[in-house]
Amino acid sequence: LIIGFGISGRHSITVTTVASAGNIGEDGILSCTFEPDIKLSDIVIQWLKEGVLGLVHEFKEGKDELSEQDEMFRGRTAVFADQVIVGNASLRLKNVQLTDAGTYKCYIITSKGKGNANLEYKTGAFSMPEVNVDYNASSETLRCEAPRWFPQPTVVWASQVDQGANFSEVSNTSFELNSENVTMKVVSVLYNVTINNTYSCMIENDIAKATGDIKVTESEIKRRSHLQLLNSKAS
């Protein structure tokens, strides 16, 4: 969480951002809130990016003002216009690119004052893993697949029964470049698994951590997976 304060002749207002991550090819949110003002026509929101000459986005007098927008963001940005009056200056970024990573500034002017806060935005790819029993294999084998990751993640297997065990000797992980030549498909195979046990396939890079669990018994198979973004710090 980053909290910034204005330092002008006017009063300062508090602006708060949250560091976040964008998934390449999908839409992302750059989060920013400020002390609300009841005078909508007086509110100005400016999003700037370090190293970029033009503006990322500008909202003023109740609508987008994009004449100064940098080419790299053309047609890809929007604020939640209906939420500005209650202090939400968050920016929706369409079709996130690897090059969108960097330091952004959310700069706010209201009738009460000015304020700004910076935001670190990371970009990469992350996806939910799915763990299945590989019936084609000669021995009891589990296959963990996740379609899109970048940068290249680490993959670690764990087991409920053999807690703390190192499965690196009985697993094999491969990374296959996807067609857009940036993200990769992750495939990890775990051999010699035993029934009546829960196995976890954990995939992690500096942006996200995802886990796929599978419980194999004689009568059924139960699966569960979840994904968590790392380093969501407010500012």
Partner: antibody
Framework: EVQLVQSGAEVKKPGASVKVSCKVS????????MHWVRQAPGQGLEWIGA????????EYAPKFQGRVTLTADTSTSTAYMELSSLRSEDTAVYYC??????????WGQGTTVTVSS | DIQMTQSPSSLSASVGDRVTITCQAT??????LNWYQQKPGKAPKFLIY???QLAEGVPSRFSGSGSGTDYTLTISSLQPEDFATYYC?????????FGGGTKVEIK
């Protein structure tokens, strides 16, 4: 659940003052503007003013400037509207209304103020 | 101040009718307009925000549209519980101002 609960009806004489309260629950009271709106019998809605409890910033409609005072007690999440120098045309239902998710999204039940000699 | 002219001031309609209420601002309010429903002896109820977005729990027979200075509230098929007074509110420019109201009565 968001709730705005107002104080009871008041009967006042011309020239007197009235203070209406509005107790808030269900959202962060200090971080959002609280407005006051009134409605005279058989008439439309009229904005009086607003307060930002976190900083005690206030804004008033020019018509009420100098005669209305908005305050807030952040310890009890209660907003107050005091109207002085009452006259018969101030007879109305007074509402508090929040701007939490949107402008005037939640309303108090209203407080009837009757000014009569 | 921005003036909001609401029309008609009252209308009579039957259950199942399509009803349209309009609000005209004295200047562009950039879609910064909400609609409220009020029944006798009750506080106004939040209906539509930012011209066209339905508030939580509001039936889909209600819809809003408009831009610039002209805005419309439409009830596609009037139900018995819809007989009430409707108000528009502009919050683009200070101070916020309401329309005069439209009373929807049973024919």
């Amino acid at each position: 659940e968001v709730q705005l609960v107002q104080s009871g009806a008041e009967v006042k004489k011309p020239g007197a003052s009235v203070k209406v309260s509005c107790k808030v629950s269900g959202y962060p009271f200090t971080s959002y503007w609280m407005h006051w709106v009134r409605q005279a019998p058989g008439q439309g809605l009229e904005w009086i003013g607003a307060i930002y409890p976190g900083k005690s910033d206030t804004e008033y409609a020019p018509k009420f400037q100098g005669r209305v005072t908005l305050t807030a007690d952040t310890s009890t999440s209660t907003a107050y509207m005091e109207l002085s120098s009452l006259r018969s045309e101030d007879t109305a239902v007074y509402y508090c209304t929040s701007t939490w998710t949107h402008y005037f999204d939640y309303w108090g039940q209203g407080t009837t103020v009757t000014v009569s000699s | 101040d921005i003036q909001m002219t609401q029309s008609p001031s009252s209308l009579s309609a039957s259950v199942g009718d399509r009803v349209t209420i309009t609000c005209q601002a004295t200047q562009d309010i950039v879609k910064s307009l909400n609609w409220y429903q009020q029944k006798p002896g009750k506080a106004p109820k939040f209906l539509i925000y930012y011209t066209a977005q339905l508030a939580e729990g509001v039936p889909s027979r209600f819809s809003g549209s408009g831009s610039g200075t002209d805005y419309t509230l439409t009830i596609s098929s009037l139900q018995p519980e819809d007989f009430a007074t409707y108000y528009c509110l502009q919050f683009y420019e200070f101070p916020p101002t309401f329309g005069g109201g439209t009373k929807v009565e049973i024919k």
